[in-house]
Interface confidence: medium
């Protein structure tokens, strides 16, 4: 229903705390360089204004759209052009073009320092002094680094953060209480960020229909007892929520997500038997819980998929009558029978089925033509199954760090033109799939592996789009989202690449590496590994292993030496010589 004042409506629906959090996230995602204090001031002004509209919906400017109100605030920031360059040009436009312009200027890789966690005592002190400001800083720092982070989910992570600090800051050993818990939240939040970015990419590049297909497959897997109309209702609502968040309409997004959670909990009987535990939780936890709820038990008496979609004499008639609904039904029926498949695979199968009907229904004997379609799915299913087996076997043999290195070599060979920091980030993220998925039961591995890899590769594509350097990457990133992962997997060594000349300084290290945290040490070593592959793209695994073992030994020796600096300056050049010889 239409409201006189949109801002008053959202403030009333969301409550002050969530309203302020969401406005802060919105501003931080649009203007990623501004300080927390600058944004906090704007948020307070917007909140005060919202309160005046709650008191009197007819007050001046209360009838303006949220985009207009927020855009006017952002455009009033002093020194906008100095700090943001051409983003300031957005302010010359009218809505809705102005908001579109802001969205286009969101930076997926802002040049901000990594978000450093203060040490435990300092963190607890500032948290106790002012929990609201502390959490505001958290929202601001995450949102500006992840401009497409799913806003209501970020509120959930902030709530988790808050609960951990409340608990751990009361303990004697704050550090050992905080570190593992906050590391866990950080890991989950980073995965949430790349997953959501993938959803926004799907929406931006291929439109609502593509996202809705993704949602139908995912929901059908989770809720196999819900009927097709129920699944499409949920998919339609979920598409709206995600469209709003991806479009920067964070208040509407959070409000509609709460509505969807409420609907699901009120209609458990027609959706799933597994929702009750989630529905007993408060709002943010409830919505989060529903988004990752376990799959309902599949109905025992499901007929073979072939009955409706291959053997039925009316297949072409049903398809012609309403293509979208017929294909949607196919996707629903296939997905509910296969919780063990990835959504990407299910969408590839639906695409294959559609292409088969398009071809066969135009022929003289359609049933003879489409009669083998399910058999033709086999290679499409085998490919990701083999990928999972091969990679999980490798992960089990090498462990996470070794597995990351194997992926780093593989991807540097596929796309050696890509910058080393991007390759290292991608390989480290891709390598985490082992820890995340390979330990799961067999029937959960494929969906976990492939859908996670797809999300990571989407980030590779986004970063590559900014500065395209590899034809291989451009080729894989230009196709449909669901074909990307198979495309990257199929890439081989880039034969067009001219190897980088050997630069000794690339492989020169100093004693400061010894005091780095383990993660930073790994990144330094992986940077060297990528550079080695760029120098010798056809180096064998054995050659690279020899060099990396030597390198690890060198670091170990010099970091234990009494005079570290001398060790590095004398042994370093010897290492470089040995590396060149080993790769000759």
């Amino acid at each position: 229903e239409a409201h006189k004042s949109e801002i008053a409506h959202r403030y009333n629906d969301l409550g002050e705390q969530h309203f302020k959090g969401l406005v802060l996230i919105a501003f931080s995602q649009y203007l990623q360089k501004c300080s927390y204090d600058e944004h906090a001031k704007l948020v307070q002004e917007v909140t005060d204004f919202a309160k005046t509209c709650v008191a009197d919906e007819s007050a001046a400017n209360c009838d303006k759209s949220l985009h207009t109100l927020f855009g006017d605030k952002l455009c009033a920031i002093p020194n906008l052009r100095e700090n943001y360059g051409e983003l300031a040009d957005c302010c010359t436009k009218q809505e809705p073009e102005r908001n579109e312009c802001f969205l286009q200027h969101k930076d997926d890789n802002p040049s901000l320092p990594p978000f450093e966690r203060p040490e435990a005592e300092a963190m607890c002190t500032s948290f106790k002094e002012n929990p609201t400001t502390f959490m505001g800083h958290y929202l601001h720092e995450v949102a500006r680094r992840h401009p497409y982070f799913y806003a209501p989910e970020l509120l959930y992570y902030a709530e988790q953060y808050n609960e951990i600090l409340t608990q751990c800051c009361a303990e004697a050993d704050k550090e050992s209480c905080l570190t593992p818990k906050l590391d866990g939240v950080k890991e989950k939040a980073l995965v949430s960020s790349v997953r959501q970015r993938m959803k926004c990419s799907s929406m931006q590049k291929f439109g609502e229909r593509a996202f809705k297909a993704w949602a139908v497959a995912r929901l059908s897997q989770t809720f196999p007892n819900a009927d097709f109309a129920e699944i499409t209702k949920l998919a339609t609502d979920l598409t709206k929520v995600n469209k709003e968040c991806c479009h920067g309409d964070l208040l509407e997004c959070a409000d509609d997500r709460a509505e969807l959670a409420k609907y699901m909990c009120e209609n458990q009987a027609t959706i799933s038997s597994k929702l009750q535990t989630c529905c007993d939780k408060p709002l943010l936890k409830k919505a989060h819980c529903l988004s990752e709820v376990e799959h309902d038990t599949m109905p025992a008496d499901l007929p073979a998929i072939a009955a409706d979609f291959v053997e039925d004499q009316e297949v072409c008639k049903n398809y012609a009558e309403a293509k979208d609904v017929f294909l949607g039904t196919f996707l629903y029926e296939y997905s509910r029978r296969h919780p063990d498949y990835s959504v990407s695979l299910l969408l590839r199968l639906a695409k294959k089925y559609e292409a088969t009907l398009e071809k066969c229904c135009a022929e003289a004997n359609p049933p003879a033509c489409y009669g083998t379609v399910l058999a033709e799915f086999q290679p499409l299913v085998e490919e990701p199954k083999n990928l999972v087996k091969t990679n999980c076997d490798l992960y089990e043999k090498l462990g996470e760090y070794g597995f990351q290195n194997a992926i780093l070599v593989r991807y540097t060979q596929k796309a050696p033109q890509v910058s080393t920091p991007t390759l290292v980030e991608a390989a480290r993220n891709l390598g985490r799939v082992g820890t995340k998925c390979c330990t799961l039961p067999e029937d959960q591995r494929l969906p976990c592996v492939e859908d996670y890899l797809s999300a990571i590769l989407n980030r590779v594509c986004l970063l590559h789009e900014k500065t395209p350097v590899s034809e291989h990457v451009t080729k894989c990133c230009s196709g449909s989202l669901v074909e990307r992962r198979p495309c990257f997997s199929a890439l081989t060594v880039d034969e067009t690449y001219v190897p980088k000349e050997f630069k000794a300084e690339t492989f020169t290290f100093h004693s400061d590496i010894c005091t780095l945290p383990e993660k930073e040490k790994q990144i330094k070593k992986q940077t060297a590994l990528a550079e080695l592959v760029k120098h010798k793209p056809k180096a064998t695994a054995e050659q690279l292993k020899t060099v990396m073992d030597d390198f690890a030994q060198f670091l170990d020796t010099c970091c234990k030496a009494a005079d570290k600096d001398t060790c590095f300056s004398t042994e370093g050049p010897n290492l470089v010589t040995r590396c060149k010889d080993a790769l000759a």
Epitope: E230, K233, Y263, P299, P303, T329, E333
Partner: nanobody
Amino acid sequence: EVQLLESGGGLVQPGGSLRLSCAASGFTFDTSSMLWVRQAPGKGLEWVSVIHQSGTPTYYADSVKGRFTISRDNSKNTLYLQMNSLRAEDTAVYYCAKFPSSQFRFDYWGQGTLVTVSS
């Protein structure tokens, strides 16, 4: 026992309108998606429109999109089909059906109501 009773059919000129109703009983109507299907003389069953238990979303066969509107009143356990700009090819017996788990298999339907479009 599930009962579905359609009404509202009749003879109408091309371009005219009709509103079909379907009274439902014997099951929980407000948790069931519903649909209209039709059968033209000498032809097979053709689905026309589907409506979710809450009233949205709705789906239409391409042949009726923009002309027909499906709706429901859960307080009255009644399903409706508003048919505008009727054409000769809309002539058929219209059945309301309880929506099952599979799109093209219908669990229960009524005895139907005949719609004839002719000048």
